[in-house]
Interface confidence: low
């Protein structure tokens, strides 16, 4: 059901700063289904699109998280984005019954980045160059600094990979592109392995 997570992230990433702020404010007051708690205000207001997607999925699971996102977007007048989510919901069969199933981390497994996680953690040495390529487009300032703060290359890569489960395909492609530019022979080696 990773499609719902990706769809939520895509929708939130396409909100401007103004819209994302409004989305959060509306999330604080929107009527919730019985049994569901509210994301704490303090934490919510600090989140970027990726963090917020994670929270929506962990608090409300993918099915209800998708539905809630659609509701808030419609309430903001962003029908077009809400309709895109509606399409995803219909295509993935995200029915309300799924809300009783525990949330699962369903990151794509076929991508180069997922397939070669261990090798990349062990063998990427120019981590700062990779970070600079991802800074702003894939990594938030906080995430960028958190990875930079680690001391060894391996720890930096482990920290970087801790953010990967919430990435969409475009983010993973960006990491692959950065690796191709900075460690072309490593990528070639892994692709042939």
């Amino acid at each position: 059901m990773g499609r719902a997570r990706d769809a939520i992230l895509d929708a939130l990433e396409n909100l401007s700063g103004d819209e994302l702020k409004k989305f959060k404010m509306k999330l604080l007051t929107v009527q919730l289904r019985e049994g569901y708690g509210r994301i704490p205000r303090g934490a919510l207001l600090q989140m970027d699109a990726i963090d917020l997607t994670d929270k929506l999925v962990s608090y409300y699971l993918e099915s209800y998280g998708l539905e809630l996102t659609m509701t808030v977007l419609r309430d903001m007048g962003l029908q077009e984005l809400a309709e895109q989510l509606q399409t995803t919901k219909e295509e993935s069969g995200a029915v309300a019954a799924a809300a009783s199933v525990p949330a699962q981390s369903t990151a794509r497994t076929g991508h180069f980045v997922d397939q070669h996680r261990q090798a990349l953690i062990a063998r990427v040495t120019e981590v700062d160059g990779v970070l600079d390529a991802l800074h702003g487009s894939v990594l938030t300032e906080g995430q960028y600094q958190a990875v930079r703060a680690e001391t060894t290359s391996q720890d930096k890569m482990r920290k970087l990979f801790s953010f990967v489960p919430s990435w969409n395909l475009t983010c993973k492609d960006s990491l692959l592109q950065a690796l191709k530019e900075i460690h072309p022979y490593l990528v070639m080696d892994l692709e042939q392995s």
Epitope: N14, L15, A49, G77, Q79, G136, V138, C171
Partner: antibody, heavy 118, light 111 residues
Framework: EVQLQQSGAELVRPGSSVKMTCKTS????????MSWVKQRPGQGLEWIGY????????EYNEKFKGKATLTSDTSSSTVYMDFRSLTSEDSAIYFC???????????WGQGTTLTVSS | DIVLTQSPASLAVSLGQRATISCRAS??????????MHWYQQKPRQSPKLLIH???NLESGVPARFTGSGSGTDFTLNIHPVEEEDAATYYC?????????FGGGTKLEIK
């Protein structure tokens, strides 16, 4: 064809109010927002605010809060801007413009010229 | 408020040459999905006309000689080859945060 037809020029006294209209046609009125923009003679553009006509949701530039009020009437596909406590600084051309998804202004009215003079 | 600084304030370009207009924002107006920067053309005694939305997406019916680029804080509108009918004032506008603001405008004159 999308069209935004604005009301005619206004000559009013300082301290008074005026209501400008923007009648729309050629698209689904409730699916879009409408913005208003001010342009003083020979000067640049200044965003006043917007209204989502589907649910009446409004946002204003702080500078125009208390000065402008945006409303809409779905039955006539018309958006209104009430402008009050007028001074000579309010003399300008006022445009209504449709908001697209990215909050760009993709269709504009022809403008209403407001002159505030005693 | 986000301040948009356009440069130059005016420029004169020969017919068929390239016109380049810059717009710098006081803070980033981009996500990984989009850049919330738009470009307009306004001719004397006319309403502004949207040329480009999301920094680089050409509006329907706008000639391909208009191109937009940039992300983050630095954006550019290029017109090439310039034609007589392009004489106008060009404005950038962001829709990143409230209030939305416009650049001061760049007046293009055709030599």
């Amino acid at each position: 064809e999308v069209q935004l037809q604005q009301s005619g020029a206004e000559l009013v006294r300082p301290g008074s109010s005026v209501k400008m209209t923007c009648k729309t046609s050629g698209y689904s009125f409730s699916s879009y927002g409408m913005s208003w923009v001010k342009q003083r003679p020979g000067q640049g553009l200044e965003w006043i605010g917007y209204i989502y006509v589907g649910n009446g949701y409004t946002e204003y530039n702080e500078k125009f809060k208390g000065k402008a009020t945006l409303t809409s009437d779905t039955s006539s596909s018309t958006v209104y801007m009430d402008f009050r406590s007028l001074t000579s600084e309010d003399s300008a051309i006022y445009f209504c413009a449709r908001l697209n998804r990215g909050r760009a202004l993709d269709f504009w009215g022809q403008g209403t010229t407001l002159t505030v003079s005693s | 408020d986000i301040v948009l600084t356009q440069s130059p304030a005016s420029l004169a370009v020969s017919l068929g040459q390239r016109a380049t207009i810059s717009c710098r924002a006081s803070q980033s107006v981009s996500t990984s999905g989009h850049s919330y920067m738009h470009w307009y053309q306004q001719k004397p005694r006319q309403s502004p006309k949207l040329l480009i939305h999301f920094a680089s997406n050409l509006e329907s019916g706008v000639p391909a000689r208009f191109t937009g680029s940039g992300s983050g804080t630095d954006f550019t509108l290029n017109i090439h080859p310039v034609e007589e009918e392009d004489a106008a004032t060009y404005y950038c506008q962001h829709s990143w945060d409230l209030p939305y603001t416009f650049g001061g405008g760049t007046k293009l004159e055709i030599k």
